[in-house]
Interface confidence: low
């Protein structure tokens, strides 16, 4: 009789087992939930990474969704050519052909009258003639001296295609669109049995106060840096070099008490643009003390060191750096695979299983 459990005791044991099972399941579920925070200065590629997650892990953009980006493609294209023409006045660059001055005026008129999401043959023709002009090209080649979308040449070189009446943006066209992120954009996807919640945050400083203090329980931070920004000035104050602005922000994130136990993944992005730029603009524009060669490998490695050296807890905190091109789906897929493996490894460490 001493060893016999009463019905009440049996029920209590079952309840206890069930609670343990639920706790274990909750723990496993929590371990499988990954909270990723995308940070970085304005126009560093954060939103492009989010778009890539949709393409890679969520079957991409439907035709209907692509159609909705048509107006953004046109707006980006028009803004780009207008920005170049504005800069010609400031930089005192003349049109190669004086007849283009009429086209420039016409551009303003047609752009002002354009219906959103439509590009008339007349407007396309004006843009095409302007883009071909030698003065416009000379000004484009000096784009480090003013603000110009990275996608300017991509769209302007492809005007024949995008100006077609039946034009539907491709996945790549969508990836290249530029819309300033305001507030916080959340995206969810599953990969390698992990449930990712990714938060894209507006990079401009005016947005930062919204997020700097409110992200507890973040698994990892992906910090994006535009490598190609080393020779540009910052859009918001026109004084501080964008790379230095980015380093200042990275310093504040990397050494922040809220992120002591958070993996920091550094995406040195826009490597394709950087590779082209470094041939023409020396790295000393940004780092006067730099004594290395202006080769992609050496200059990129130097920038990597500049960022990694900001880490004040090298003994306990590792920075996982990757060179990326956010508009290249294959590259992002490869890098994100490696990032996920790091997250899994660190998760196992935290659970005492590694």
């Amino acid at each position: 009789m001493g060893c016999t459990l009463s019905a009440e005791d049996k029920a209590a044991v079952e309840r206890s087992k069930m609670i343990d099972r639920n706790l274990r399941e909750d723990g496993e579920k929590a371990a499988r939930e990954v909270k990723l925070l995308l940070l970085g200065a304005g126009e560093s590629g954060k939103s492009t990474i989010v778009k890539q997650m949709k393409i890679i892990h969520e079957a991409g953009y439907s035709e209907e969704e692509c159609k909705q980006y048509k107006a953004v493609v046109y707006s980006n294209t028009i803004q780009s050519i207008i920005a170049i023409i504005r800069a010609m006045g400031r930089l005192k660059i003349d049109f190669g052909d004086s007849a283009r001055a009429d086209d420039a005026r016409q551009l303003f008129v047609l752009a002002g009258a354009a219906e959103e999401g439509f590009m008339t043959a007349e407007l396309a023709g004006v843009i095409k003639r302007l883009w071909k002009d030698s003065g416009v090209q000379a000004c484009f080649n000096r784009s480090r001296e003013y603000q110009l979308n990275d996608s300017a040449a991509y769209y302007l070189n492809d005007l024949d295609r995008i100006a077609q009446p039946n034009y539907i943006p491709t996945q790549q066209d969508v990836l290249r669109t530029r819309v300033k992120t305001t507030g916080i954009v959340e995206t969810h996807f599953t990969f390698k049995d992990l449930h990712f919640k990714m938060f894209d945050v507006g990079g401009q400083r005016s947005e930062r106060k919204k997020w700097i203090h409110c992200f507890e329980g973040v698994t990892a931070i992906i910090f994006c840096v535009a490598l190609s920004d080393y020779d540009l000035v910052l859009a918001e104050d026109e004084e501080m070099n964008r790379m230095h602005e980015s380093m200042k922000l990275f310093d504040s994130i990397c050494n922040n008490k809220w992120f002591t136990d958070t993996s920091i993944i550094l995406f040195l992005n826009k490597k394709d643009l950087f590779e082209e730029k470094i041939k023409k603009s020396p790295l000393t524009i940004c780092y006067p003390e730099y004594a290395g060669s202006n080769t992609y490998e050496e200059a990129a490695a130097y920038i990597q060191c500049q960022f990694e050296d900001l880490n004040k807890r090298k003994d306990t905190k590792e920075i996982y750096t990757h060179f990326t091109c956010a508009t290249d789906t294959k590259n992002v897929q490869f890098v994100f695979d490696a990032v996920t493996d790091v997250i899994i490894k660190n998760n196992l460490k935290d659970c005492g299983l590694f």
Partner: nanobody
Framework: EVQLVESGGGLVQPGGSLRLSCAAS????????MNWVRQAAGKGPEWVAS????????DYAHSVKGRFTVSRDNTKNTLYLQMNSLKPDDAAVYYC?????????????WGQGTQVTVSS
């Protein structure tokens, strides 16, 4: 509220002249460069001429250079377009508009227009 009111249009024979006026109100007129823009039936708008805020600099489309003269009177908040040697191709609705730099931002201010007909 910004208002631009054009007047002076009408029917004129080829080779004839017209003087268009644009009365501006609701903004500091002498802070703005101003423009004349026209739109012929079934065609897109076409920039015609512009004048700097204080009237020092003027600029014209090739098609009207030497025939049209843009001027302004900041004391009267009025913009003018003197059109000589008119051709059938000049027939259009003529609008005055604020500086092009505001147009692509969607803050363009255009008047209602005045019709110019050139016909014998």
């Amino acid at each position: 509220e910004v208002q631009l009111v054009e007047s002076g249009g009408g029917l004129v024979q080829p080779g004839g002249s017209l003087r268009l006026s644009c009365a501006a109100s609701g903004f500091t007129f002498d802070d703005y460069a101003m423009n004349w823009v026209r739109q012929a039936a079934g065609k897109g708008p076409e920039w015609v001429a512009s004048i700097s805020s204080r009237g020092i600099t003027t600029d014209y489309a090739h098609s009207v250079k030497g025939r049209f003269t843009v001027s302004r009177d900041n004391t009267k908040n009025t913009l003018y377009l003197q059109m000589n040697s008119l051709k059938p191709d000049d027939a259009a609705v003529y609008y005055c508009a604020t500086d092009p730099s505001t147009w692509y931002r969607g803050t363009a201010h255009w008047g209602q227009g005045t019709q110019v007909t050139v016909s014998s």
